[in-house]
C-alpha cells in the first residue's frame, strides 16, 4: 500500500527527534502583556526534534516527501515537526467593559508529527 | 487579540517563502512500482520555501512561535512550510484479483502554510 | 455543570501516605490548573501548590517541599495530591480548586477532603 | 512572602447595615493598567470558599452587587452595601501576584 510503516524510534539518539516540549514564556515575549492578565507566565507546548527518514510521518505525502528528500535533498526539504493537535488554553484578558476568559483552541501543541 | 496579522508578501524575495512547487517523481523514486501501475511518472504538489516572521502562519501557535524563535532560536524552531490542505490523487494498482482504482486523499498537497 | 469532586474524608495512620483526588468535570480538564488550599479546623486557609495538567508542571509552597507531591491523569481528567510522612499537623480539610494560571482567582472549588491522621 | 493582614478580625452587624473590611498587603500587588491581583473569598460554616471578587473590583458570575472591591496598590477595601443574614460568613483576601499565594487571617461578619 501507499503507507510504508512510520518508526517511532529515534535513530538519532533520546530527546533529537520530534517530539512536544514545554517553553516557558511571560506575556511580554509573546507581545500580549497589554492585553492578557492572566497567566502572565504561559507554558506552552511546542513541537521540536528533527524527522529523520519515516519518522512520526503524518500522513502518505510526509512519506513520499521523506523518500524524495532522500532522492533531491537540494529541492525537496525534509518532513519537519509540527503540531498533530492541539489543547484548549484559558486566559484572562481586558475587555473594553472589564475582563473576560477566553478559549483559544490552536495556542498549544498537544502532540507532534512530522509533515 | 491573540492574532497578529499573518503576512503574505514574501520579504526574501520571489519564490523564496513557503510556497507550492511541482515535483515529478517516478514510481522507482517512490519505491511504489510492484504494484502501482498508473500513473509512472507522478507530478507531486510539495510545500517548499522559508518561513520568515509571521508569514502564512497557520494559527496562533505559529505566531507564537515564529515571536519565540525570534527569542530563543536556539532553543525554538522557526515555524516551517507543510500542507494545509491536500487533494485527491486516483492510482491504478495491481490487487491480488486484479487491477482497481484508489483515491487518495493525502497524498499531494493543494495549498501551504507555516506551522 | 462545572465541577471537582474530592472524596469526603480519609482517615490515615501518622507515618503513613495519602493520595488525595480532585476529578474534574464540565470543562476542558487541561485548560486551567488545578490548586490546593489546606484549612486547619477553626483556622484561616493555606495555599499548597498548583498543577498544570496540560504538561504537568508543579508548583509548591516552601513550606510543603518534601511533603506534598501533585500528580494528574488526564485520561480521567482527575489531579491528585499526595502527602507524606503524616502527623497530626497535616490533619486539615484539603480543597481543590481551579484557576486560569498560577495568579489567577480559583473561581471553582471542590467540597474539601476532611483527612484526619490518628493512630 | 507577601503577608496578608485583614481587619477587622470580626464584626457583628444588623440586617440591612452597610459593611466594609479591610485587607492590607506588605508589598504593592499592583500590575499593568491598574489590575490589582487581589482576589476576596466567601466562606460560609460547613463549605468551601467561593470567589466573591477578582483582580480587586470585578464580581464573580452569580455574586450580588451589593459586593463590591476597591482599592489598589497595597490597601483593599470589601464592601457589602446592604447586609442580608445570608451573608454570615467568613471572608478571605488573597493575593496571586506572586509565588506563592497568600490568604489574610479573614474577618468573621456575624449578623446581630
Known amino acids: 500500500s501507499a503507507h510504508a510503516h512510520p518508526r517511532d524510534s529515534c535513530p538519532l539518539g533520546p530527546g533529537r527527534c520530534c517530539h512536544l516540549e514545554t517553553v516557558q514564556a511571560t506575556l511580554e515575549d509573546l507581545g500580549w502583556s497589554d492585553w492578557v492578565l492572566s497567566p502572565r507566565q504561559l507554558q506552552l507546548s511546542m513541537c521540536v526534534g528533527e524527522c529523520p527518514h519515516l519518522y512520526r510521518s503524518a500522513n502518505t505525502h510526509a512519506q513520499i516527501k521523506a523518500r524524495l528528500h532522500g532522492l533531491q535533498p537540494d529541492k525537496v526539504p525534509a518532513p519537519c515537526c509540527v503540531p498533530s493537535s492541539y489543547t484548549p488554553v484559558v486566559l484572562m484578558h481586558r475587555t473594553d467593559s472589564g475582563v473576560s476568559l477566553q478559549t483559544y483552541d490552536d495556542l498549544v501543541a498537544r502532540g507532534c508529527h512530522c509533515a | 487579540s491573540a492574532h497578529a496579522h499573518p503576512r503574505d508578501s514574501c520579504p526574501l524575495g520571489p519564490g523564496r517563502c513557503c510556497h507550492l512547487e511541482t515535483v515529478q517523481a517516478t514510481l522507482e523514486d517512490l519505491g511504489w512500482s510492484d504494484w502501482v501501475l498508473s500513473p509512472r511518472q507522478l507530478q507531486l504538489s510539495m510545500c517548499v520555501g522559508e518561513c520568515p516572521h509571521l508569514y502564512r502562519s497557520a494559527n496562533t501557535h505559529a505566531q507564537i512561535k515564529a515571536r519565540l524563535h525570534g527569542l530563543q532560536p536556539d532553543k525554538v524552531p522557526a515555524p516551517c512550510c507543510v500542507p494545509s490542505s491536500y487533494t485527491p490523487v486516483v492510482l491504478m494498482h495491481r490487487t491480488d484479483s486484479g487491477v482497481s482504482l484508489q483515491t487518495y486523499d493525502d497524498l499531494v498537497a493543494r495549498g501551504c502554510h507555516c506551522a | 455543570q462545572v465541577q471537582l469532586q474530592q472524596p469526603g474524608a480519609e482517615l490515615v495512620k501518622p507515618g503513613a501516605s495519602v493520595k488525595m483526588s480532585c476529578k474534574a468535570s464540565?470543562?476542558?480538564?487541561e485548560g486551567w490548573y488545578i490548586h490546593w488550599v489546606k484549612q486547619r479546623p477553626g483556622q484561616g486557609l493555606e495555599w499548597m501548590g498548583w498543577n498544570n495538567p496540560r504538561t504537568g508542571l508543579t508548583n509548591h509552597a516552601q513550606k510543603f517541599q518534601g511533603k506534598v507531591t501533585m500528580t494528574r491523569d488526564t485520561s480521567s481528567s482527575t489531579a491528585y495530591m499526595q502527602l507524606s510522612s503524616l502527623t497530626s499537623e497535616d490533619s486539615a480539610v484539603y480543597y481543590c480548586a481551579r484557576g486560569v494560571g498560577a495568579d489567577a482567582a480559583f473561581d471553582i472549588w471542590g467540597q474539601g477532603t476532611t483527612l484526619t491522621v490518628s493512630s | 512572602d507577601i503577608v496578608m493582614t485583614q481587619s477587622p478580625s470580626s464584626l457583628s452587624v444588623s440586617a440591612g447595615e452597610k459593611v466594609t473590611m479591610s485587607c492590607r498587603s506588605s508589598?504593592?500587588?499592583?500590575?499593568?493598567?491598574?489590575?490589582?491581583?487581589l482576589d476576596w473569598y466567601q466562606q460560609k460554616p460547613g463549605q468551601p470558599p467561593k470567589l466573591l471578587i477578582y483582580?480587586?473590583?470585578n464580581r464573580a458570575h452569580g455574586v450580588p452587587d451589593r459586593f463590591t472591591g476597591s482599592g489598589s496598590g497595597t490597601d483593599f477595601t470589601l464592601t457589602i452595601s446592604s447586609v442580608q443574614a445570608e451573608d454570615l460568613a467568613v471572608y478571605y483576601c488573597m493575593q496571586s501576584f506572586e509565588t506563592p499565594i497568600t490568604f489574610g487571617g479573614g474577618t468573621k461578619l456575624e449578623i446581630k
Open positions: 483582580l480587586d473590583r
Open positions: 508589598q504593592s500587588l499592583l500590575w499593568k493598567h491598574g489590575y490589582n491581583y
Open positions: 464540565g470543562y476542558p480538564f
